[in-house]
Interface confidence: low
């Protein structure tokens, strides 16, 4: 038994870790492996973490870590019963993954603006609060090439748009998801979408 | 640190044989992959294969399959590349790099130069 | 198996601009398992970025990688003159292949 793709762990800067690897041939990632991790710290403990299966050959660990600071270290040992297979660190700040926004609702009943809010998923206390932006992603379900992107690179978690920049008498979907440039960190997963009915009152034309 | 240490520079005529080393440190070689990967004067990288030293285990480019063989000694930390029959166009950097799927580090490289 | 098309082949930009460079796969690659490399003449390549976007250890943080599916991109946010090299993509979502690679120039 042995690992053909190494550890990678991402981490959501508050109170989990994923690490992913692949294994070269099936295996039963929860009975044959232990992913052991340890903060690199004065006294310190060992926590282990039993990995699940992702796929024939590839296993996933959630790793459950205390706040995380921008200095901590942990190093990771994967073993199999008595055989280390891998030995690594990994330093959480360095390596981020937010996670998803939630509640996005879309409240149509403000004139002819549509106003899209979410849920920062930290609470305030933590780092990224008051550090991440978003991308807002609507698209018709109607017309694959009706797709589109807003940035919101302000800290409130909305977007206002007219309602008239979107076909009226079509459902829309939208979701959206997060990022932090002082940590370079990638993209969250996107939040569950929210669907909605566009309809607004055409102006009368001018003649 | 880290480090993968190839064996030196070869100058060898069409049909010779030739074994070229890359010596592993300051990790633990059994249980990580070597790969090899070969770039022709001016040209791009192209991956060879790997193995892992522990078992010897050996996976193939196509590409590669049947012209090269790789094989280790795991006793002295060491992986080869090995050719039985040389060609003109083999001749080209040879780089050993810890890994399976991406490579760091790499040795420093082995130039092998095939002329008659 | 999977080709991978870097774009452009030379990029010419003056230190402290923001380069970016392209690979593009004849197929998707599976989990994001894409690769980038720097390689300085007379060098071995160096690992810069693995899983896409996670930077190898060591690498500054003005190299970063994103994208997924069939198209990824390497930045390089203000270039300094040691950024002057040979880049190289490469996937290892099925077997293991390399873009044939990008020079970045000085202008």
């Known amino acids: 038994m042995k690992v053909l793709q190494e550890p990678t762990c991402v981490s959501d800067y508050m109170s989990i870790s994923t690490c992913e690897w692949k294994m070269n041939g099936p295996t039963n990632c929860s009975t044959e492996l232990r992913l052991l991790y340890q903060l690199v710290f004065l006294l310190s403990e060992a926590h282990t973490c039993i990995p699940e299966n992702n796929g024939g050959a590839g296993c996933v660990c959630h790793l459950l870590m205390d706040d995380v600071v921008s200095a901590d270290n942990y190093t990771l040992d994967l073993w199999a019963g008595q055989q280390l297979l891998w030995k690594g660190s990994f330093k959480p700040s360095e390596h981020v993954k937010p996670r998803a926004p939630g509640n996005l609702t879309v409240h149509t009943n403000v004139s002819d603006t549509l106003l899209l809010t979410w849920s920062n998923p930290y609470p305030p206390d933590n780092y990224l609060y008051n550090h991440l932006t978003y991308a807002v992603n609507i698209w018709s379900e109607n017309d694959p090439a009706d797709f589109r992107i807003y940035n919101v690179t302000y800290l409130e978690p909305s977007l206002r748009i007219a309602a008239s920049t979107l076909k009226s008498g079509i459902s829309y979907r939208a979701r959206v998801r997060a990022w932090a440039q002082c940590y370079n960190t990638t993209w969250s997963e996107w939040s569950p979408s929210t669907k909605w009915h566009n309809s607004y009152r055409e102006p009368f034309e001018q003649h | 640190e880290v480090q993968l240490v190839q064996s030196g520079a070869e100058v060898k005529k069409p049909g010779e044989s030739l074994k070229i080393s890359c010596k592993g440190s300051?990790?633990?070689?059994?249980?990580?992959?070597i790969g090899w990967v070969r770039q022709m004067p001016g040209k791009g990288l192209e991956w060879m294969g790997i193995i892992y030293p522990d078992d010897s285990d050996t996976r193939y480019s196509p590409s590669f399959q049947g012209q090269v063989t790789i094989s280790a000694d795991k006793s002295i930390n060491t992986a080869y590349l090995h050719w039985n029959s040389l060609k003109s166009s083999d001749t080209a950097i040879y780089y050993c790099?810890?890994?399976?799927?991406?490579?760091?580090?790499w040795g420093q490289g082995t130039l092998v130069t095939v002329s008659s | 198996e999977i080709v991978l098309t870097q774009s452009p082949g030379i990029l010419s930009l003056s230190p402290g601009k923001r380069a970016t460079l392209s690979c593009r796969a004849s197929q998707s690659v599976s989990s994001n398992f894409l690769a980038w490399y720097q390689q300085k003449p007379g060098q071995a390549p160096r690992l810069l970025i693995y899983g896409t976007s996670s930077r190898a250890n060591g690498i500054p943080d003005r190299f970063s990688g994103s994208g997924s599916g069939t198209d990824f991109t390497l930045t390089i946010s203000g270039l300094e003159p040691e950024d002057f090299a040979e880049y190289y993509c490469q996937q290892y979502g099925s077997s293991v292949t390399f873009g044939q690679g990008t020079r970045l120039e000085i202008k």
């Open positions: 300051g990790y633990r070689f059994t249980t990580n992959w």
């Open positions: 790099a810890r890994g399976a799927n991406w490579f760091d580090p």
